[in-house]
Amino acid sequence: LQDPCSNCPAGTFCDNNRNQICSPCPPNSFSSAGGQRTCDICRQCKGVFRTRKECSSTSNAECDCTPGFHCLGAGCSMCEQDCKQGQELTKKGCKDCCFGTFNDQKRGICRPWTNCSLDGKSVLVNGTKERDVVCGPSPTDFSPGTPSTTMPVPGGEPGHTSH
């Protein structure tokens, strides 16, 4: 025998209190698939979360983060504070990347500069807190008479002292 609840479309629920007829989900709830026996409560995007997509009878609300924060986790389950480029978030707040490391995003951790010599290459552009080094061809790649090209250093200074 076919389950009468299977006829209930998304946006409704199979109401046991009303002889298993399909009742519409009430405001602030949803059912994204048919045959549901209950409607789920809509997610509330409050505080540091903001609403990216409103809840409807057939789909949950989707949240993102207010400016100055970014999403973490599946479905933006958490909001984490942004830092500036050249910084990383620690338990004590945003801290500058240590010498020899960089972060070119507002999130994540500082990563070590690329070690050009491991690939037998030379440093073409020095690293900064915000940018990785740019590796150039190894000195032996330059044939006599070929002018070497220089590139501007992102961020201005070629490097910085440790803190």
Epitope: P27, C55, S56, S57
Partner: antibody, heavy 117, light 112 residues
Framework: QSVEESGGRLVTPGTPLTLTCTVS????????MIWVRQAPGKGLEWIGV?????YISHATWVKGRFTISKTSTTVGLEITSPTTEDTATYFC??????????????WGQGTLVTVSS | DIVMTQTPASVEAAVGGTVTIKCQAS??????LAWYQQKPGQPPKLLIY???TLASGVSSRFKGSGSGTEFTLTISDLESADAATYYC??????????????FGGGTEVVVK
């Protein structure tokens, strides 16, 4: 896409009256529809809403004075027992989307109901 | 129930001037607020939704702001065509009272 109200007329107090909101160019299974009224020289007053999934919610003050219904292409508003205070222009409006917290961007021209003995 | 209180009831300003209309909600409605313009014999016209987003085709002279319980509609560089009654409306469907589409009392704008 359009919304049109009809059924407004002069009625005597206590005589039930049903107004109809007929829609074209869109589906009522995608949008919420709201009923709003405006007494002569007064402000807008929300009566009730029927959502895309068929859920109906009335303003608290309604207390059984109005009944909202829905078919595939129309939304009805029954004034169950009109009084002279129900004399107003009745508007029907469509929501901008299918969300619970929606706003209303497509309005009909309204239909005038006059209740008088 | 959510109650929307609009002030002032009427305001008069000259062409080219600026008008500010306030709307206060009896409980926090986040940014779920719309503003409508209504001229005599016409249905309301949506101006602003989500407190500050301009509806399609609406002049940028109309500016909405606020969140929570306090909201403002500002009309700058007033034109004679702006003479109308303006209403705020909450579209916060899911308050504790489930009475989420209440209108403010309206503000009549008279342009001199």
């Amino acid at each position: 896409q359009s919304v049109e109200e009809s059924g407004g007329r002069l009625v005597t107090p206590g005589t039930p009256l049903t107004l109809t909101c007929t829609v074209s160019g869109f589906s009522l299974s995608t949008y919420a529809m709201i009923w709003v009224r405006q007494a002569p020289g007064k402000g807008l007053e929300w009566i009730g809403v029927v959502y895309d999934n068929g859920y109906i919610s009335h303003a608290t003050w309604v207390k059984g004075r109005f009944t909202i219904s829905k078919t595939s292409t129309t939304v009805g508003l029954e004034i169950t027992s009109p009084t002279t205070e129900d004399t107003a222009t009745y508007f029907c409006a469509r929501s901008a989307d299918g969300s619970w917290s929606t706003y209303f961007n497509l309005w009909g021209q309204g239909t005038l109901v006059t209740v008088s003995s | 129930d959510i109650v929307m209180t609009q002030t002032p009831a009427s305001v008069e300003a000259a062409v080219g001037g600026t008008v500010t209309i306030k709307c206060q909600a009896s409980e926090s409605i986040s940014n779920y607020l719309a503003w409508y313009q209504q001229k005599p014999g016409q249905p309301p016209k949506l101006l602003i939704y989500k407190a500050s987003t301009l509806a399609s085709g609406v002049s940028s002279r109309f500016k909405g702001s606020g969140s929570g319980t306090e909201f403002t509609l500002t009309i700058s560089d007033l034109e004679s065509a702006d003479a109308a009654t303006y209403y705020c409306q909450t579209n916060y469907c899911c308050s504790s009272s489930d009475n989420g589409f209440a209108f403010g009392g309206g503000t009549e704008v008279v342009v001199k």
